[in-house]
Interface confidence: low
């Protein structure tokens, strides 16, 4: 990444697995060195309001109390370092939710996985990939959002009631597409527009529910950068 170049932003859903991609272009003559390549991932947590990210989020142990105002930016720390022989190190004990895919590493994919991602994981990440005589780097900013589906009115419904389902993700830009579906037996059944299903952006309006509408409803929000999030809601309609 050139100095002053914009850091790519990766979005993830709180509570879901997140991939921090890193597949640097490796010169052909160095491909044979991948087996012995090492990688170090570092995290600079976002400074933010007290609730957001006190302490070192990926480090174990108690987090220090947050300052009463937005404090100085937390220090960068090493999340995970994997040596040429696959030896892992980092803040002990290493958290199982921080993972590198061993097979991917041998193909030149040094992505870091957070399983699951937490709010405090937001911030800037840098990866340094060490080959025999050179180092390649990746840099990105992880932003985390919360996904939710709400029903209005909430709670159980009676036959012939109306309901609006709203599918949302806390991200400033609008999704490029919204797909609604029902979870049924063998898989997902798309919800088609009909006199009983009015689709409008991230809203689904059911003007007259029936007991057939009981059960899980889902939406998939897809953004222009390819990020997508799937959200479920269980609707209860009394006969």
């Amino acid at each position: 990444l050139q100095p002053g170049a914009e850091v790519p932003v990766v979005w993830a859903q709180e509570g879901a697995p997140a991939q921090l991609p890193c597949s640097p272009t490796i010169p052909l003559q160095d491909l044979s060195l991948l087996r012995r390549a090492g990688v170090t991932w570092q995290h600079q947590p976002d400074s933010g309001p007290p609730a957001a990210a006190p302490g070192h989020p990926l480090a174990p142990g108690p987090h220090p109390a947050a300052p009463s105002s937005w404090g100085p930016r937390p220090r960068r720390y090493t999340v995970l370092s994997v040596g040429p022989g696959g030896l892992r190190s980092g803040r002990l004990p290493l958290q199982p939710r921080v993972q590198l895919d061993e097979r991917g590493r041998q193909r030149g994919d040094f992505s870091l996985w957070l399983r699951p991602a937490r709010r405090a994981d937001a911030g800037e990440y840098r990866a340094a990939v060490h080959l025999r005589d050179r180092a390649l780097s990746c840099r990105l900013r992880l932003r985390l959002g919360q996904a939710s589906m709400t029903a209005s009115p909430p709670g159980s419904l009676r036959a012939s009631d109306w309901v609006i389902l709203n599918c949302s993700f806390s991200r400033p830009d609008r999704p490029a597409s919204v797909h609604w579906f029902r979870n049924r037996g063998q898989g997902r059944v798309p919800v088609r527009e009909s006199p009983h299903h009015h689709l409008a952006e991230s809203f689904l309006f059911l003007p007259q529910v029936s007991p057939m509408d009981s059960g899980p409803w889902g939406c998939i929000l897809t953004y222009r950068d390819g990020f997508n999030v799937s959200i479920m809601y269980n609707l209860t309609v009394l006969g």
């Epitope: 029902r182 049924r184 037996g185 059944v189 088609r192 527009e193 009909s194 006199p195 009983h196 299903h197 009015h198 689709l199 409008a200 059911l206 007259q208 029936s210 057939m212 059960g215």
Partner: antibody
Framework: QVQLQQSGAELARPGASVKLSCKAS????????INWVKQRTGQGLEWIGE????????YYNEKFKDKATLTADKSSSTAYMELRSLTSEDSAVYFC???????????????WGQGTSVTVSS | DIVLTQSPASLAVSLGQRATISCRAS??????????LHWYQQKPGQAPKLLIY???NLESGIPARFSGSGSRTDFTLTINPVETDDVATYYC?????????FGGGTKLEIK
């Protein structure tokens, strides 16, 4: 009463395009889907696709995706189907039909137009 | 695509007798506790007309001589008793999965 009035018969040359119309009356045009169905002489029925006029959302049979384009004009309560790159295989009667309501799930076609005959011949 | 196979392709029934038409789907057309299969009647030179929706529900204005039954992959349209006005071709249609497909049709004649 619900009525779907289709445009008159079309005679077209191979490679040409035709645009069929289906004017709806007697109900709220934007509240129901309009389906299009093909029937070749002496043959069965084939579903081409559906348009939902309120939003313009369309659902196509993959087989007809490159052949048919469905549109709707809310102001005149009219649905259209354009057929392009016509060949003799497209010679058929084309019906428009309203999608009914039955609990909102994958509804049947409860009212049909009288059909438009399209003949492709050089 | 879901294939609907109708049998017989044609049948001749005496006035006042029962006519039974079968429609078999290549996979289940059931969902949400219902069977998404409909029956239509088409008379020569006319548009199809909806008879039965969701396997067994009689469309408004259709005589009770028509009835439908079945679930999952096997469905039956019964006309009892058959009248002269019933001479037509009958089609089943599934709408559980796109593309929404029709059976090949069954032509009913009077003996």
């Amino acid at each position: 009463q619900v009525q779907l009035q289709q445009s008159g018969a079309e005679l077209a040359r191979p490679g040409a395009s035709v645009k069929l119309s289906c004017k709806a009356s007697g109900y709220s045009f934007t509240s129901y889907g309009i389906n299009w169905v093909k029937q070749r002489t002496g043959q069965g029925l084939e579903w081409i696709g559906e348009i939902y006029p309120r939003s313009g959302n369309t659902y196509y049979n993959e087989k007809f995706k490159d052949k048919a384009t469905l549109t709707a004009d809310k102001s005149s309560s009219t649905a259209y189907m354009e057929l392009r790159s016509l060949t003799s295989e497209d010679s058929a009667v084309y019906f428009c039909a309203r999608g009914g309501t039955y609990d909102g799930y994958y509804y049947a076609m409860d009212f049909w137009g009288q059909g438009t005959s399209v003949t492709v011949s050089s | 695509d879901i294939v609907l196979t109708q049998s017989p392709a044609s049948l001749a029934v005496s006035l006042g007798q029962r006519a039974t038409i079968s429609c078999r789907a290549s996979e289940s057309v059931d969902n949400f506790g219902s069977s998404f299969l409909h029956w239509y009647q088409q008379k020569p030179g006319q548009a199809p007309k909806l008879l039965i929706y969701r396997a067994s529900n009689l469309e408004s204005g259709i005589p009770a001589r028509f009835s439908g039954s079945g679930s999952r992959t096997d469905f039956t349209l019964t006309i009892n008793p058959v009248e002269t006005d019933d001479v037509a071709t009958y089609y089943c249609q599934q709408v559980n999965k796109d593309p929404r497909t029709f059976g090949g049709g069954t032509k009913l004649e009077i003996k």
